[in-house]
């Protein structure tokens, strides 16, 4: 059978009392249940204690009373009674709140920001809030906008709420600035400040600065790093997906660099620590803002283990004719990781023997050839950390014109 | 305590121009709009425009947008609506009115009495 | 625009008794932020209009509790419960959900 909503001992949907007097609430339900307090209150442990107890006839019900003593103006807020354990289907109907103004003569705005003011970020067309709520829903407040405007509510595209502040419904270029809330509470007249930052949500570019595809061993850890270009104005949320995800097998640590004077680059770092099978396959970088939505992906080979494959391009025994400008003596190789390369001429280092020799990856070029050119050229490859070893040998001819 | 003052009555020839006033009192001038209406004889009212006093920003009913003119002087807490070229289907009751959409208000507007504005020769 | 309609007169009702007006929009009032901007006006004899209910169900400030608003998006009812003397006048629904403010032509109460 439906639970009955939690009852809360102060009626209404609303409740004034004076800042330095204690509130007293009580909860009474039919179940186990939960307080749900402003920011503020839940921080103090000094002036706010809970006690529980059976109550009702025979003790059937439960009954929650919360105490805060010395209340203050910023304890101002939603004060709610909760069940606890109930299907979210049911929320609704059993959750008891009220509103608790805390009048503070000295303090008409919950939260004061009269020097440095906040900043709100906004964008065009969505709501916005200024969000200088009251201690009393009886304390006259005015919006201006710097340096003469006042933005006067309309009850539509404008809106005072006391709980919040002025609701704004579609923003505009004209709410971008400083905007003031101001009260005059006794004579004294107080001020709270934000400014708007209009917030775009272009993306300029998006990049996985690593490789593409990746390559690793078995057991290595991958790092990718996706960068996200935007105007200076505009946020932007970074998610990556990959094909081990539902084991939250990633760590991913973000971070903004704000240094250039014309963009924003947002860095976000994926780490997985021992690579295996499982984590092989297409890893995405996401960026979102607000509408606008940009993609980057790189694949991931993970490999057992290290290897070097070798073989002739064409076929073992090469020609060429002397005074030939270049020649490029090149192997096909696969290998993971990259191993170091050296040529060998006749046994001996090629590049050390002349000048003339270069390695170019897996080839040597021999500039300017000439006759002393032709013997046999090995290839050494090896991947020293995983104590592989490969190597193979061609033979050039030289002809002479 | 909130008044909105008008005058009584106008009289003015057709094709003449009229400058009506507004002065406020009571509350900061600043802080609301002032919106004008009219009411010709027997008949119900028209919402004509309204002036935000702060910056002088006015909307008007597409209807009234070549026939009115709205302004304000801060300094007077006062506020002005030009009707120009005036024939016999001008000739109504313009009031002024300070709507107040605040909770603390609990949304109260305050209207002037009104001005009687005869157009004729 | 939008276009408010009223009848021109109520019935005519008995002092101490209830009294009803309506009123039709030509489209629905209510807003995607949940409020209805339905305005109801009593002009009295000789005065200016005076603001009754705001945002269809809303008593504006001073303003007795026998007069009660309800209504869906399009049709609309004012109430008073209690008709005394000085109600007596024109009762006028206007909109303010799309420039311009739009009013209807006025119900005339008639007492007995």
């Known amino acids: 059978s439906k639970l009955k909503d939690p009852e809360l001992s102060l009626k209404g949907t609303q409740h004034i009392m004076q800042a330095g007097q204690t509130l007293h609430l009580q909860c009474r339900g039919e179940a186990a249940h939960k307080w749900s307090l402003p920011e503020m209150v839940s921080k103090e442990s000094e002036r706010l204690s809970i006690t529980k107890s059976a109550c009702g006839r025979n003790g059937k019900q439960f009954c929650s009373t919360l105490t805060l003593n010395t209340a203050q103006a910023n304890h101002t807020g939603f004060y709610s009674c909760k069940y606890l354990a109930v299907p979210t289907s049911k929320k609704k109907e059993t959750e008891s709140a009220i509103y608790i103004f805390i009048s503070d003569t000295g303090r008409p705005f919950v939260e004061m920001y009269s020097e440095i003011p906040e900043i709100i970020h906004m964008t065009e067309g969505r709501e916005l809030v200024i969000p200088c709520r009251v201690t009393s829903p009886n304390i006259t407040v005015t919006l201006k906008k710097f340096p003469l405007d006042t933005l006067i509510p309309d009850g539509k595209r404008i809106i005072w709420d006391s709980r919040k502040g002025f609701i704004i419904s579609n923003a505009t270029y004209k709410e971008i600035g400083l905007l003031t809330c101001e009260a005059t509470v006794n004579g004294h007249l107080y001020k709270t400040n934000y400014l708007t930052h209009r917030q775009t949500n272009t993306i300029i570019d998006v990049q996985i600065s690593t490789p593409r595809p990746v390559k690793l061993l078995r057991g290595h850890t991958l790092v990718l790093n996706c960068t996200a270009t935007t105007p200076l104005n505009t946020r932007v949320q970074m998610t990556w997906s990959y094909p081990d995800e539902k084991n939250k097998r990633a760590s991913v640590r973000r971070r903004i660099d704000q240094s250039n004077s014309h963009a924003n680059i947002f860095y976000s770092v994926l780490t997985i620590d021992k690579m295996q099978n499982k984590d092989k396959g297409l890893y995405t970088c996401r960026v979102r803002s607000g509408p606008s939505f940009k993609s980057v992906n790189t694949s991931v080979h993970i490999y057992d283990k290290a290897f070097i494959t070798v073989k002739h391009r064409k076929q073992q025994v090469l020609e060429t004719v002397a005074g030939k400008r270049s020649y490029r003596l090149s192997m096909k190789v696969k290998a993971f990781p990259s191993p170091e390369v050296v040529w060998l001429k006749d046994g001996l280092p090629a590049t050390e023997k002349s000048a003339r020799y270069l390695t170019r990856g897996y080839s040597l070029i021999i500039k300017d050839v000439t006759e002393e050119d032709a013997g046999n050229y090995t290839i050494l490859l090896s991947i020293k950390q995983s104590n592989v070893f490969k190597n193979l040998t061609a033979t050039l001819i030289v002809n002479v014109k | 305590q909130v008044q909105l003052q008008q005058p009584g009555a106008e009289l003015v020839k057709p094709g003449a121009s009229v400058k009506l006033f507004c002065k406020a009192s009571g509350y900061t001038f600043t802080n609301y709009y002032i919106y004008w209406m009219r009411q010709r004889p027997g008949k119900g009212l028209e919402w004509i425009g309204e002036i935000n006093p702060s910056n002088g920003d006015t909307t008007f009913n597409e209807k009234f947008k070549t026939k009115a003119t709205l302004t304000v002087d801060k300094s007077s807490s006062t506020a002005y609506m030009q009707l120009s070229s005036l024939t016999s289907e001008d000739s109504a009751v313009y009031y002024c009115?300070?709507?107040?959409?605040?909770?603390?208000?609990?949304?109260?507007?305050?209207w002037g009495q009104g001005t009687s504005v005869t157009v004729s020769s | 625009d939008i276009v408010m309609t009223q009848a021109a007169f109520s019935n005519p009702v008995t002092l101490g008794t209830s009294a009803s007006i309506s009123c039709r929009s030509s489209k629905s009032l209510l807003h995607s932020n949940g409020i209805t901007y339905l305005y109801w006006y009593l002009q009295k004899p000789g005065q200016s209009p005076q603001l009754l209910i705001y945002q269809m169900s809303n008593l504006a400030s001073g303003v007795p509790d026998r007069f009660s608003s309800s209504g869906s998006g399009t049709d609309f009812t004012l109430r008073i419960s209690r008709v005394e003397a000085e109600d007596v006048g024109v009762y006028y629904c206007?909109?303010?959900?799309?420039?311009?403010?739009?009013f209807g032509e006025g119900t005339k109460l008639e007492i007995k």
């Open positions: 009115t300070r709507p107040s959409f605040y909770s603390y208000d609990y949304y109260k507007d305050y």
């Open positions: 206007a909109q303010n959900l799309e420039l311009p403010w739009t």
